[in-house]
Interface confidence: medium
């Protein structure tokens, strides 16, 4: 996360680190005792479950036990819109035990449309600078807002690449954004409860004024999530 402050896992108890061969790859959000929501592009190189682990319950990357993954379910890839459908579900082998530092976040409602400038939060262990640097050892957080899709698709921005199944978030002047390593983590909105309205997906650079972060719009994929679950207990 770029333009940030340190976070406590007590504040974001649904945040997990998704790791391959003990290396942090992506963030994710706990939805219930068995399921974690994340981004499909996290699994482009490796889809086998065996070397993937999930770490929950700490704001420090290396300091908490890893959880085995039972399955990874990735939505169908759409070659016409390769950045679309950036969503995946991970099923844990054993259910999580909830505590003050391990808790789920709510899915959004079908009709949850957020207007431009609505305040949102981003979190992650990703890069803190646009060009390189390294992963943060501690969880970082930042406040952003919904950026209008028309603005996001302007000629000096994403030029129509942001589809209706995506949303943009950042701050108008730039400087606050998600970055490499934050992928899969939640874009969060607080009403009566916290809702995961977006999944960190893609963007050009990190924190540029005309190119805010682009997020998978979770409400557009609720039917897909429910269709996965209809077959599961």
């Amino acid at each position: 996360v770029v333009g940030v402050e340190e976070a406590s896992v007590d504040s974001w108890p649904w945040q997990v680190s998704i790791q391959y061969d003990k290396q942090h790859v992506c963030g994710g959000s706990i939805l219930d005792p068995h399921w974690v929501l994340t981004a499909a592009h996290c699994f482009r190189k490796h889809t086998d479950v065996f070397n993937w682990k999930v770490r929950a319950g700490s704001d420090k990357l290396g300091s908490f036990p890893s959880l085995a993954v039972a399955k990874i379910i990735i939505i169908e890839f759409n070659p016409m819109y390769p950045k679309d459908n950036d969503i995946a579900l991970m099923k844990l082998q054993f259910p999580l035990t909830f505590s003050g530092t391990v808790r789920p976040i709510c899915l959004p409602f079908f009709d949850e449309e957020l207007t431009p400038a609505t305040p949102l939060w981003i979190i992650g262990w990703g890069f803190t600078k646009q060009n390189g640097g390294k992963m943060s050892d501690i969880l970082l957080q930042a406040s952003v807002q919904v950026i209008d899709s028309t603005r996001c698709n302007a000629d000096d921005a994403y030029q129509g690449e942001v589809t209706e199944k995506m949303m943009c978030a950042g701050i108008p002047e730039g400087g606050v954004d998600t970055c490499q390593g934050d992928s899969g983590g939640p874009l969060m909105y607080q009403s009566d409860q916290w809702h995961v309205v977006g999944i960190v997906s893609w963007g050009y650079g990190c924190g540029g004024p005309s190119t805010p972060g682009v997020y998978t719009k979770v409400s557009a994929y609720l039917n897909w999530i429910y269709n996965v679950w209809k077959a599961e207990l």
Epitope: P33, P95, P104, F110, W229, K230, A231, E232
Partner: antibody, heavy 118, light 107 residues
Framework: QMQLVESGGGLVQPGRSLRLSCAAS????????IHWVRQAPGKGLEWVSG????????GYGDSVKGRFTISRDNAKNSLDLQMNSLRAEDTAVYYC???????????WGQGTMVTVSS | DIQMTQSPSSVSASVGDRITITCRAS??????LNWYQQKPGKAPKLLIY???SLQSGVPSRFSGSGSGTDFTLTIRGLQPDDFGTYYC?????????FGQGTKLDIK
């Protein structure tokens, strides 16, 4: 149309066994988890057991754990509930139900009555 | 196990009334809350899933709200056909659990 039809209910003595079946039609059976829910006379609904689409995961209510076994045959579009060591408190109408959106139960059978009495 | 508590246990109302049934979970269940209607001698019928989503074919006078531990089923413009018993159910984890039911009589 989409339906579930239960069979196998009846009168049985305490300690004996009974096997309930549920036949599905009108939808792709192996796309869905299926559950058993029961209702004792004049009482509310109680979840008994459920099974995932591929039988990989099964679950049981506390009151039937160790006595009941759920199974499915996707080739035959059928679900079974083997009930052993039956007790008077197992007397109920047993429904099979399809798991769907939000893991809710969107299609229910008409129910089959099981009476456990000496 | 997660306990589900409904209130009231029974309610009597007139055609055209607006009625509210509440359901409370013993721990947070996010939005994994479903509502069913059951008529005497019949199987239950799904009304609302995911706390707020109306099941296909269910009249729009039924609506659901809530998340976390507190949930509400509202029926606006009560119809004679709406009598029966209403149940909430959590689909957050196993075992699935139901509320004890709310019996709705039409005056």
């Amino acid at each position: 149309q989409m339906q579930l039809v239960e069979s196998g209910g009846g009168l049985v003595q305490p300690g004996r066994s009974l096997r309930l079946s549920c036949a599905a039609s009108g939808f792709t059976f192996d796309d869905y988890a299926i559950h058993w829910v029961r209702q004792a006379p004049g009482k509310g609904l109680e979840w008994v057991s459920g099974i995932s689409w591929n039988s990989e995961i099964v679950g049981y209510g506390d009151s039937v754990k160790g006595r009941f076994t759920i199974s499915r045959d996707n080739a035959k579009n059928s679900l079974d509930l083997q009930m052993n060591s039956l007790r008077a408190e197992d007397t109920a109408v047993y429904y099979c139900a399809r798991g769907s959106s939000g893991r809710a139960f969107d299609i229910w059978g008409q129910g089959t009555m099981v009476t456990v009495s000496s | 196990d997660i306990q589900m508590t409904q209130s009231p246990s029974s309610v009597s109302a007139s055609v055209g009334d607006r009625i509210t049934i509440t359901c409370r979970a013993s721990q947070s269940i996010s939005t994994y809350l479903n509502w069913y209607q059951q008529k005497p001698g019949k199987a239950p019928k799904l009304l609302i899933y995911g706390a707020t989503s109306l099941q296909s074919g269910v009249p729009s006078r039924f609506s659901g709200s809530g998340s976390g531990t507190d949930f509400t089923l509202t029926i606006r413009g009560l119809q004679p056909d709406d009598f029966g018993t209403y149940y909430c159910q959590q689909s957050y984890n196993l075992p699935r659990t139901f509320g004890q039911g709310t019996k709705l009589d039409i005056k």
